[in-house]
Interface confidence: medium
């Protein structure tokens, strides 16, 4: 017959074969042959793999590192990994929470919705069109753009959501 | 080298007035919003102000509001707290912060004790 080209759902090609992927929870040891299955093992204490793999090394469960205030929220299993979350009081920096902040702040192009509390973070927006936000603040909404009209000038920059507009003379020659 | 170093603290009765500095160096002050943090005996860090680099924007918890100045002057790279009208609650130790992370650098702090 003539050798697969492309294989069914949970298994992969390998020498012109289709071989049974690894489940979740278990790592690559040897490829499937015409005679044999393919060799999984499962992984290790503090390792993980988390999909249908053909991996041959499993990964390392994130450490929640109590120096950067961080704990762990849900320990790992061979499936999943660790999920961290941060002391009392303080805040993820990212969805990943790598890291702590007391408050969080917002990057240049958002600005601050709600100020953070003593139980929640900071909220941060995107900066709509005609606004900017060119700061890192935990304070700071999005400023709107210069009217460069009400000045008498024109645009000769345009704004973004991270920059002001650039306004400048006007051309005073006219037809 | 990031250094903030705070200063003023001390003790002073109920309804008493203080004013804390914190001098920065190793970073490019007028760059950064500055806050003060404090944290009372068995508490944990409580936010309580802030300011704009430029000094025109400041923010305040509401447990301060009213009674408490931030400022700052960014040719001395010193960043102040006036506090009036001061209550036994605003017992802390007093820290000023240029970023909020758990790991970032952070002063030794001034010690404020309302009392009489």
């Known amino acids: 017959p003539e050798p697969p080209t492309a294989c069914r759902e949970k298994q992969y090609l390998i020498n012109s074969q289709c071989c049974s992927l690894c489940q979740p929870g278990q790592k690559l040891v040897s490829d499937c042959t015409e005679f044999t299955e393919t060799e999984c093992l499962p992984c290790g204490e503090s390792e993980f793999l988390d999909t249908w793999n053909r991996e041959t090394h499993c990964h390392q469960h994130k450490y929640c590192d109590p120096n950067l205030g961080l704990r762990v929220q849900q320990k790992g299993t061979s499936e999943t990994d660790t999920i961290c979350t941060c002391e009392e009081g303080w805040h993820c920096t990212s969805e990943a929470c790598e890291s702590c902040v007391l408050h969080r702040s917002c990057s240049p192009g958002f600005g601050v919705k709600q100020i953070a509390t003593g139980v929640s973070d900071t909220i941060c927006e995107p900066c709509p069109v005609g606004f900017f936000s060119n700061v890192s603040s935990a304070f700071e909404k999005c400023h709107p753009w210069t009217s460069c009209e009400t000045k008498d000038l024109v645009v000769q920059q345009a704004g973004t959501n991270k920059t002001d507009v650039v306004c400048g003379p006007q051309d005073r020659l006219r037809a | 080298e990031v250094q903030l170093l705070e200063s003023g603290g001390g003790l002073v009765q109920p309804g008493g007035s203080l004013r804390l500095s914190c001098v920065a160096s190793?970073?490019?002050?007028?760059?950064?919003?500055m806050q003060w943090v404090r944290q009372a005996p068995g508490n944990g860090l409580e936010w309580i102000s802030a300011i704009s680099g430029d000094g025109y924007r400041t923010y305040y918890a509401d447990s301060v509001k009213g009674r408490f100045t931030i400022s700052r002057d960014n040719s001395k790279n010193t960043l102040y707290l006036q506090m009036n009208s001061l209550r036994a609650e605003d017992t802390a130790v007093y820290y000023c912060?240029?970023?909020?992370?758990?790991?970032?650098?952070w002063g030794r702090g001034t010690l404020v004790t309302v009392s009489s």
């Open positions: 912060a240029k970023e909020l992370g758990y790991f970032d650098y």
């Open positions: 190793g970073f490019t002050f007028e760059w950064y919003e």
